[in-house]
């Protein structure tokens, strides 16, 4: 077991195109040992993007994150701004990963598990699906995250998460700003630990949500520019380790994909994935229920499924 | 075809609240968002804010945080928004409209509903 | 706050004319601007995103264009029905900002 603080573990080879700030939540520099110095933006539907720190609209909207946290923190909210070992923050289940970004997860000895992270609205408004998460997690920023509608028609369903060591990640998240719940649209790259939540400020006037429906495929997402075309990426199966390709998604406005490659490593599970405690407590799903992700295979290209050992992970789709 | 139906026009109080309505048809309502936006008499347009319908969580502009609440019914279709302690200066065109996933931009309105405050 | 500053606020033009209509933003809104039509008592309607991404039903005589603090629409050839009042939106960052309106009369 070895922590590689200075190892690179967030690699990026494509840069996505823009993204407008008001999708984004936070920002991670990777590490000087990956060479392509790259920001890592995570979107309010916790997906991970490479982007370019030389482009302005990069630079423009790291200031306004960085603003947006400094508000916060003289309001008297929460955000993080991790120093030094810094877990992922979502998981490949719970969002799409830019196929320019490797995220090398390195076994650390602890069990610690990679949190499907409920890709609110942001996700959906993606591509309109998320994991399905039981109501009222919370996220690392003490807010209450609102629990996210099923995938939509024709996705793969009733995909379970599994739990891997944490990635340990030596970037920095330099700005965090009020999570905003909330649909967007781009190629990623994901994360474990809990994600932050909706902005605090909303909770009050969240709606009660009934059971969740399914939605269809392609609705509420558009096109922003030349991009790539969806490559439905259904079959879950994959060689037990390696990296695992997460496709370019849907966002076709997003550029030539900039999702994730996530190397995981699947661990023994007890049948109840862990949450590690987060900033306003912990939450354990019941034993009995298994959390299930529910996505469309357009928006997610890595799809994880929760594994008893490392041979099932071809197994159990 | 996409439709957005909002409720009738309302003559409020000032101090009073007001609950405008507004029911989706033609596509997935958990799918996109729900904006607000009001138009005040001869005026530009302003932004309130958002609710995702698939997962309830709203978004606001700060101008009108602490006295509006935006919520969603899934299972009829019907968005709301709830604004409180009314004033004059509240007399406006209320609008939903439908924000895509992919940015918020609105690419159908609701045929608005006129909410007049006065004493 | 993104201030949006349309001009001008109104023209006056005829048929077959090429209409020109300005929005400027107070901060880079990296293209991230809708324009609208409106027609008295009506709700806006959608006409490009995008910066120039014409929206579902919208004539190509409208087009968009611009980039940084300075966006244009063109309406290439003004048709009866385009006389209307147009605004701009940013949805680069919240709190979502609109310009003024320009309103388009019949000259």
């Known amino acids: 077991q070895h922590h590689g603080v200075t190892k690179c573990n967030i690699t990026c080879s494509k840069m996505t195109s823009k993204i407008p700030v008001a999708l984004l939540i936070h920002y991670q520099q990777n590490q000087a040992s990956c060479g392509k110095r790259a920001i890592i933006l995570e979107t309010r539907q916790h997906r991970l993007f490479c982007a370019d720190p030389k482009e302005q609209w990069v630079k423009d909207a790291m200031q306004h994150l960085d603003r947006q946290a400094a508000a916060l923190t003289r309001n008297g909210g929460t955000f993080e701004k991790q120093i030094g070992e810094v877990k992922p923050r979502t998981t490949p289940a719970a969002g799409g990963m830019d196929e320019s970004v490797v995220l090398e997860p390195e076994a650390t000895g602890e069990s610690s598990s990679l949190e499907p992270t409920p890709s609110s609205q942001e996700a959906q408004r993606a591509l309109g699906t998320s994991p399905e998460l039981p109501t009222g997690v919370t996220g690392s920023s003490g807010t209450r995250l609102p629990p996210t509608p099923k995938a939509q028609d024709g996705g793969p369903v009733g995909t379970e998460l599994f739990r891997v060591p944490p990635v340990s990640t030596a970037a920095t998240w330099q700005s965090s700003a009020p999570h905003q719940p909330g649909p967007s649209l781009w190629a990623e790259a994901k994360t474990s630990e809990a994600p932050s939540t909706q902005d605090p400020s909303t909770q009050a006037s969240t709606a009660s949500s009934p059971a969740p429906e399914e939605n269809a495929p392609s609705e509420g997402q558009r096109v922003w520019g030349q991009g790539q075309s969806p490559r439905p990426e259904n079959s879950l199966e994959r060689e037990e380790m390696g990296p695992v390709p997460a496709h370019t998604d849907a966002f076709q406005d997003w550029g030539p994909g900039s999702m994730a490659h996530v190397s995981v490593v699947p661990v023994s599970s007890e049948g109840t994935p862990s949450r590690e405690p987060v900033a306003s407590g912990s939450w354990t799903p019941k034993a009995e229920e298994p959390i299930h992700a529910t996505m469309d295979p357009q928006r997610l290209g890595v799809l994880i499924t929760p594994v008893p050992d490392a041979q099932a992970a071809t197994r159990r789709q | 075809q996409v439709q957005l139906v909002q409720s009738g026009a309302e003559v409020k109080k000032p101090g009073a609240s007001v609950k405008v309505s507004c029911k989706a048809s033609g596509y997935t309502f958990t799918n996109y968002y729900i904006h607000w936006v009001r138009q005040a008499p001869g005026q530009g347009l302003e932004w309130i804010g958002w609710?995702?319908?698939?997962?309830?969580?709203?978004k606001f502009n700060e101008r009108f945080k602490g006295r509006t609440t935006l919520t969603a019914d899934k299972s009829t279709s019907t968005a709301y928004m709830e604004l409180s302690s009314l004033r004059s200066e509240d007399t406006a065109v209320y609008f939903c409209?439908?924000?895509?996933?992919?940015?918020?931009?609105?690419?159908?309105w609701g045929q608005g509903t006129t909410v007049t405050v006065s004493s | 706050d993104i201030q949006m500053t349309q001009s001008p606020s109104s023209l006056s033009a005829s048929v077959g004319d090429r209409v020109t209509i300005t929005c400027r933003a107070s901060g880079n809104i990296h293209n991230f601007l809708a324009w609208y039509q409106q027609k008295p008592g009506k709700a806006p309607k959608l006409l490009i995103y995008n910066e120039k991404t014409l929206a579902d039903g919208v004539p190509s005589r409208f087009s968009g264009s611009g980039s940084g603090t300075q966006y244009t629409l063109t309406i290439s050839s003004l048709q009866p029905e385009d006389f209307a009042t147009y605004f701009c939106?940013?949805?680069?960052?919240?709190?979502?900002?609109f310009g003024g309106g320009t309103k388009v009369e019949i000259k």
């Open positions: 409209a439908r924000g895509p996933t992919d940015g918020d931009y609105f690419d159908y």
């Open positions: 609710i995702y319908p698939g997962d309830g969580s709203p």
């Open positions: 939106q940013q949805f680069w960052s919240t709190p979502y900002t």
